[in-house]
């Protein structure tokens, strides 16, 4: 807290320029008024203000808007923005794309704080869903922002803001975020041709469930290894050997490399093993010839 | 970690001149701007010098026309050039930058000495 003092003559601000980093704490207190500073905000960004100047002149600005500020002031905050709290955004009311941007850009390069957590939060919460453009900005600045949000957030993602996904934005999402995002990228797809849709639904296969890879596996896609191993298990297991070679095209020789890991190792003992030696890649571990199958899941269902 | 170690102080007459050197190093961000800061004997400190990151100087009303603030941005040094030294200059001169990109930082050196005799 600054002390109460007179500003000393000739030392009243007129207004917010370079001269005032040379005024010592009490003097930006009792010289510069909130009001000035308030609307030319956007000339403090380019002041080099001192870290306790900046104290100053965000203790002027909660003087005066004790109920939070006006996006007006908070869109040119410029780097007075990471002298903020959690606790000071969350009075904002911020609707602009723009201050979000302006906002995000000062923090740019960085992890997410937890400043910009809370932005982002107000800011989606105060449209109601996270459209296409919020989307664009917020995968822009942060990549795996996506992946950031619960599945119940995510269900707030309209299919068309899907367009604005990156493969790489998905990279650290988990297998119950896929499972949202994968039917509203289905949706948003659905009028693609074969290989245009392949290359788009890709990134979203985690998801999938085992009837649309068996519909995949009718289009000579040729899906990668790295795409397979990111399907969820449950799915894969009741493809035939035959759909996954058409699946993987090519690829299928991959799969002798992942063989001990899931989900090809699981699928694998769920096979012939006659079936898989038809494959040419010495994938061992399949139902020898002779033994009868019981889906257990299927009686435990009956009784 | 971002290091910045002074250089270039000492003792001169009244009416000399000095060139402070400041070699900062460990700086893995943009710089907003580096500066000058000065402690006379038993006094606060004061801002003398600035520079920011475009080239923009601004100098202490005391100190204009009399120091001029430059930077080496190839060799992350700064200087201060200062000439027609009176005692009122003597004191510590401390080094200091600012980051203001993903954090608000401001990084000091150890400082130099500069005594000015009359």
């Known amino acids: 807290e600054v002390e109460k003092t007179a500003c000393p003559s000739g030392k009243k601000a007129r207004e917010i320029d370079e001269s005032l980093i040379f005024y010592k704490k009490w003097e930006l207190e009792a010289c510069v008024d909130a009001a000035l500073l308030a609307t030319q905000m956007d000339r403090v960004n380019a002041i080099p203000f001192t870290y306790e100047q900046l104290d100053v002149l965000k203790h002027k600005l909660d003087e005066l808007y004790p109920q939070g500020y006006p996006e007006s002031v908070i869109q040119h905050l410029g780097y007075l923005f990471l002298k903020m709290s959690p606790e000071d955004i969350r009075k904002w009311n911020v609707t602009s794309l723009e201050t979000l941007k302006a906002l995000l850009e000062v923090n740019k390069g960085h992890e997410m704080s937890p400043q910009v957590a809370t932005l982002i939060d107000r800011f989606v919460k105060g449209r109601g869903q996270l459209d296409k453009d919020t989307l664009d900005t917020l995968t822009a600045f942060y990549p795996g922002y996506l992946c950031s949000l619960s599945p119940e957030e995510l269900s707030s993602v309209p299919p068309s803001s899907i367009w604005a996904v990156r493969p790489q934005d998905l990279d650290t999402c988990d297998p119950r975020q896929l499972d949202v995002l994968y039917p509203k990228a289905r949706l948003a797809f659905q009028n693609m041709n074969g290989s245009e849709y392949f290359v788009k639904i890709q990134s979203f296969l985690g998801g999938a469930p085992t009837e649309d890879l068996k519909a995949l596996s009718q289009q000579n896609v040729s899906m990668d290894l790295a795409t397979f191993m990111k399907l969820r298990t449950d799915a894969v297991l009741p493809l035939t050997v035959a759909e996954v070679q058409k699946l993987l095209g090519p690829h299928v020789e991959g799969l002798k490399a992942e063989e001990r890991h899931r989900p090809v190792r699981d699928w694998i003992l769920r096979q012939r093993q006659d079936d898989l030696d038809t494959l040419g890649l010495g994938l061992q571990g399949g139902i020898p010839n002779g033994y009868l199958v019981l889906d257990l899941s299927m009686q435990e269902a009956l009784s | 970690q971002v290091q910045l170690v002074e250089s270039g102080g000492g003792l001169v007459q009244a009416g000399g001149s000095l060139r402070l050197s400041c070699a900062a190093s460990g700086i893995t961000f943009p710089v907003n701007a580096y500066g000058w800061y000065r402690q006379a004997p038993g006094k606060g400190l004061e801002l003398v010098a600035i520079?920011?990151?475009?080239?923009?100087?601004n100098y202490a009303d005391s100190v204009k026309g009399r120091f001029a603030i430059s930077k080496d941005n190839v060799n992350n040094t700064v200087y201060l050039q200062m000439n027609s030294l009176t005692s009122e200059d003597t004191g510590v001169y401390y080094c200091?930058?600012?980051?203001?990109?993903?954090?608000?930082?401001?990084?000091w050196g150890q400082g130099t000495q500069v005594t000015v005799s009359s």
């Open positions: 520079i920011s990151a475009g080239g923009t100087t």
């Open positions: 200091y930058l600012q980051r203001r990109i993903g954090m608000l930082r401001d990084y």
